[in-house]
């Protein structure tokens, strides 16, 4: 989690900075959304608790050809300790409903803002 260099600076990025940058990117996506995000692609919703970052990546990585979320996918990979590939789902990822990417991003953003306010950067 401390090796998140490359987003804003050349060296290791503090977790608080990395989280803030992820939040800023999600805000940017939601504010600049003109047409439906990723053509209305649907992804598995996730439980916003333990293993959230990996679960979010596992869900979003399946969407290809959507430039709007490519940076988010890269950022989330920095928070996830293991390599995630398309079609891969951990035991933490319960597949019970699919939602549009736009809603997924909004839900994730709200939760990350809450974590940031509470000082939970890891």
């Amino acid at each position: 989690l401390t090796c998140l260099g490359g987003f804003a600076s050349p060296g290791p990025v503090p977790p608080s900075t990395a989280l803030r940058e992820l939040i800023e990117e999600l805000v940017n996506i939601t504010q600049n959304q003109k047409a439906p995000l990723c053509n209305g692609s649907m992804v598995w919703s996730i439980n916003l608790t333990a293993g959230m970052y990996c679960a979010a990546l596992e869900s979003l990585i399946n969407v290809s050809g959507c430039s709007a979320i490519e940076k988010t996918q890269r950022m989330l990979s920095g928070f996830c300790p293991h390599k995630v590939s398309a079609g891969q789902f951990s035991s933490l990822h319960v597949r019970d409903t699919k939602i549009e990417v736009a809603q997924f991003v909004k839900d994730l953003l709200l939760h990350l803002k809450k974590l940031f306010r509470e000082g939970q950067f890891n």
Epitope: P36, M42, C66
Partner: nanobody
Amino acid sequence: EVQLLESGGGLVQPGGSLRLSCAASGFTFDREEMDWVRQAPGKGREWVSTISPRGRTTYYADSVRGRFTISRDNSKNMLYLQMNGLRAEDTAVYYCAKAYTGFKYWGQGTLVTVSS
């Protein structure tokens, strides 16, 4: 080019059944997870069901679980949705979709109307 053509919709009474079909072409069907998505009049898109590439694993929205059954025939590049115990709230245009690609590749859909 990805093409998806849905059929099988119609007017049915509450409690009735319909079987929707979707003919797929332009991609390697047996490698792709497939979805059924619906859109009720004046409402947003709602995920209905998903089936794994080989058809071994299926997933359903709570609203249709136990009533709808998704299946596929990879030899024919066909996707199906058997709908039993239909309710008024199931009235919608139903689309089949190549998972994770969005409505860029949706067909025209097939209208299901549940009414007495």
